[in-house]
């Protein structure tokens, strides 16, 4: 007799997915000497033990704790950079500056990326054939979990001067729903963090409007104001050449307004 | 590119003992887990054994459990396989891998040695 199964509303587990987390941790481990005393099977056993057998609607943080505890990573708390609704650009930015971190340049950021993953309450396997969607199902599934646990830490680590950039083809500049709205700005903390410097990246070639005056970025303004941390905001006019001016800031060009 | 060299096969009684090493070149050696596995004639692969990058977690398969034990030295790249109780079920070509790890199913391997021959026999 074939079990009863639960039917979500999102996409199943990423295909292949123990290991594409096995291979990606050996591949960063491999690449961030600093990193290199992680045990990658421990890795995968606590992020495995974080969602398998559990009802895929009940996860909460400390699941994720042991999963966190192995990963710890401690990156430069002033050069991080946070985004939302921009993540490609966002990570063309880091892989040129190489100095500068997003969450996804950090190990547990990095396993997890762009992947799904649930389980089933009571039972051993993965389900690939769908998991709980957000919206539609419920907030407290693995994958959302996981992402308000690492970003709430990464927010949490940050000082000095932190940068967001953000998608100014969007019609909303800033979403108090997103991660970044939700979870990090209200994780940043004052006494280490001074500024939040705001990029606002424009889309289109002739779009000359200042994005900084935005109605949802004033909010943004007002956010963090209110937690006693400064605001800043500059656009982002040119986003290709934005990338070749920090690839070549020598160049003639790299002076003007980007 | 990566080099996988096994030594310390050989003719053993059975109830004997043998220990074999596996020493790895090529890759950054303590970051991939390290398997055994072994081919009887005219049988396919069978896993035998599995360590983890930091030696931390080890897996073994139900007919060697108790028997083998598997172990490395992360400073001379060098992996382990010692091996008691020798049966006549045990005879093969015993191959050490590298690779991701065990996700409580499957090893994942990557690369494999060449081999080295375990003869038990009275």
């Known amino acids: 007799v074939p079990r009863w199964r639960q039917q979500w509303s999102g996409p199943g587990t990423t295909k292949r997915f123990p290991e594409t987390v096995l291979a990606r941790c050996v591949k960063y481990t491999e690449i961030h000497p600093e990193m290199r005393h992680v045990d990658c099977q421990s890795v995968w056993d606590a992020f495995k033990g974080a969602f398998i057998s559990k009802h895929p609607c009940n996860i909460t943080e400390e699941d994720y704790q042991p999963l966190m505890k192995l990963g710890t990573q401690t990156v430069p708390c002033n050069k991080i950079l946070l985004w939302s609704r921009i993540k490609d650009l966002a990570h063309q930015f880091t892989q040129v500056q190489r100095d500068m971190f997003t969450l996804e340049d950090t190990l547990l950021g990095y396993l997890a990326d762009d992947l799904t993953w649930c389980g089933e309450f009571n039972t051993s396997k993965i389900n690939y054939q769908s998991c709980p969607d957000w919206r539609k199902d419920c907030s407290n599934n693995p994958v959302s979990v996981f992402w308000k646990t690492v970003s709430r830490r990464f927010a949490e680590a940050a000082c000095d001067v932190v940068h967001v950039m953000l998608n100014g083809s969007r019609s909303k500049i800033f979403d108090k729903n997103s991660t970044f709205g939700s979870v990090e700005v209200h994780n940043l903390q004052p006494e280490k963090v001074q500024t939040l410097e705001a990029w606002v990246i424009h889309g289109g070639r002739e779009d000359s409007r200042d994005l900084c005056q935005d109605p949802t970025i004033k909010e943004l303004e007002s956010i963090i104001s209110k937690r006693n941390i400064q605001f800043s905001c500059k656009n982002i006019y040119r986003p290709d050449k934005f990338l070749q001016c920090v690839k070549n800031p020598e160049d003639s060009s790299c002076t003007s307004e980007i | 590119e990566v080099q996988l060299l096994e030594s310390g096969g050989g003719l053993v009684q059975p109830g004997g003992s043998l220990r074999l090493s596996c020493a790895a070149s090529?890759?950054?050696?303590?970051?991939?887990?390290m398997s055994w596995v072994r081919q009887a004639p005219g049988m396919g692969p069978e896993w035998v054994s599995g360590v983890s990058g930091s030696g931390i977690n080890t897996y073994y398969a139900d007919s060697v459990k108790g028997r083998f034990t598997i172990s490395r030295d992360n400073s001379k790249n060098t992996v382990y396989l010692e091996m008691n109780s020798l049966r006549a079920e045990d005879t093969a070509v015993y191959y050490c891998a590298s690779g991701k790890g065990w996700d409580g199913n499957t090893w994942y391997e990557d690369y494999r040695g060449q081999g080295t021959l375990v003869t038990v026999s009275s």
């Open positions: 090529g890759f950054i050696f303590s970051v991939y887990a």
